[in-house]
C-alpha cells in the first residue's frame, strides 16, 4: 500500500495564563496546529490556539502532555483522569472536510468546541481535550 | 448531523463521570445560543489508564 496515514488532531485546550506567539509555516493561518501524521489518532496533545493575524497563531502555554506511541506517557500514570465523550450536533451537516484538520470547516468547528469546553469546565481540574474526531450522525 | 468524539483530561479526583456528563448537559442550551450548536445524545465514559487512543475510539463507535 502507498501513502502514510495521518492523525486526527489531538489538541489540548487549556486556559493557560502565560502566552506566546509563534509563526505558522503556512501562509494561511490555521487556528490549530496540524499534528505529526503517523497514526489514526495520535496521543500528542498540543496547545489550544486562536487565530490572530494572517501569519501568526496565539498559543496558551500548557504542561507538556505528549506521547511517542499509542499509550499515554509515564508521567501521566498518576494524577490525571480521562473521560471519553461523544455527542451529536444535529444542526450541522457532516462532510468529508471534517476528516481533515487543514480544512476551514474542521478548524472552525474544532475551535468552537474547544472554546465551549473551556466555558463548561471552568473549575481548576480541567486539563484539556484531545483526540477529537468527527463522523456522520 | 455530526457526531463528535473526544477525550477530556482532568486532574485526578476533581470530577467523576456523572459530573462530567451533568455539567455538559447543563450547558447545552447556552451552546445553542452562543455557538449555534444543537447538542444531543451525550455519552460519557471512563477511559481506563493506560489507554490506547485508537482502540479507545474504536470500542466506542
Amino acid at each position: 500500500a502507498s501513502g502514510s496515514a495521518s492523525g486526527s488532531a489531538s489538541t489540548l485546550v487549556h486556559n493557560g495564563t502565560s502566552a506566546r506567539a509563534t509563526t505558522t509555516p503556512a501562509s494561511k493561518s490555521t487556528p490549530f496546529s496540524i499534528p505529526s501524521h503517523h497514526s489514526d489518532t495520535p496521543t500528542t496533545l498540543a496547545s489550544h490556539s486562536t487565530k490572530t493575524d494572517a501569519s501568526s497563531t496565539h498559543h496558551s502555554s500548557v504542561p507538556p502532555l505528549t506521547s511517542s506511541n499509542h499509550s499515554t506517557s509515564p508521567q501521566l500514570s498518576t494524577g490525571v483522569s480521562f473521560f471519553f465523550l461523544s455527542f451529536h450536533i444535529s444542526n450541522l451537516q457532516f462532510n468529508s472536510s471534517l476528516e481533515d484538520p487543514s480544512t476551514d470547516y474542521y478548524q472552525e468547528l474544532q475551535r468552537d468546541i474547544s472554546e465551549m469546553f473551556l466555558q463548561i469546565y471552568k473549575q481548576g481540574g480541567f486539563l484539556g481535550l484531545s483526540n477529537i474526531k468527527f463522523r456522520p450522525g | 448531523s455530526v457526531v463528535v468524539q473526544l477525550t477530556l483530561a482532568f486532574r485526578e479526583g476533581t470530577i467523576n463521570v456523572h459530573d462530567v456528563e451533568t455539567q455538559f448537559n447543563q450547558y447545552k442550551t447556552e451552546a445553542a445560543s452562543r455557538y449555534n450548536l444543537t447538542i444531543s445524545d451525550v455519552s460519557v465514559s471512563d477511559v481506563p489508564f493506560p489507554f490506547s487512543a485508537q482502540s479507545h475510539h474504536h470500542h466506542h463507535h
Epitope: A5, T41, S96 | -
Partner: antibody, heavy 117, light 107 residues
Framework: EVQLVQSGAEVKKPGASVKVSCKAS????????INWVRQRPGQGLEWIGY????????EYNEKFKGRVTLTSDTSASTAYMELSSLRSEDTAVYYC??????????WGQGTLVTVSS | DIQLTQSPSSLSASVGDRVTITCRAS??????LNWLQQEPGGAIKRLIY???SLDSGVPKRFSGSRSGSDYTLTISSLQPEDFATYYC?????????FGGGTKVEIK
Amino acid sequence: EVQLVQSGAEVKKPGASVKVSCKASGYTFTSYGINWVRQRPGQGLEWIGYIYLGSDYTEYNEKFKGRVTLTSDTSASTAYMELSSLRSEDTAVYYCARSAGSLFAYWGQGTLVTVSS
Amino acid sequence: DIQLTQSPSSLSASVGDRVTITCRASQDIGITLNWLQQEPGGAIKRLIYATSSLDSGVPKRFSGSRSGSDYTLTISSLQPEDFATYYCLQYASSPYTFGGGTKVEIK
C-alpha cells in the same frame, strides 16, 4: 501497516455495470472515509466520490451522479464503487484512497476496468 | 470547480538535480493541497499533505510550500526512484480536483 487491496481487472461490455471493491487491512479502525478516483489511459486523475465507511454518507462528483453508487460493508472493512451504463470512455484504472486523520492518506493499487464490445 | 494548473507537464533531469513543480489554484484553497507521486507501474503515494507537511516515511528531500495561489513541490536532490509523475490535489471544496500532472524523466 495499512493496506488497501482492490479487486482484480474487469472487462465489460457497453451498457453493463461494474463493481470494484477496496478492502482495508492493517488497522481495525473502522471509521474513516474512502475516496474513489479514476485515471483514463494516458490521462490525469479524476475524483469520483466519497463514502464514510459504516454510514450511508456519500458525496459524488456531479459528472458521475446517477451512474455511480458507493457502498460499504463495515464488518468486512470494504468499500465498493459500482458504475453503471458503461461506455468506452469509462475504460480506466479506478483507485480507492482512504482517510487516516486526513484525506487521501493511503491509496489502493488500482483496478483496471476495460469497456469493450 | 476549482482548477489546478500544474507546470511543467514534463521535465527531464539528472540524478542530483533540484526539481521544482508548481500548481496554481484558480480560487483560494488555503493549505488544503496534497502532492502525490505516481510510479510508472501506476502505484500512487501521498508525499505532502496540507501544503507543506511531509508524510511519514517520505524522504526529506521532498518539500512543499506556498506563495499566494502558487503551490510548489521541490525535490532537493533527485534520486533514481524519483522518476515518476507528480500530481497536486485540492480538497478545499467538492468536487476535489487534480493538477494535470508532471512527468519527471531521466535526462
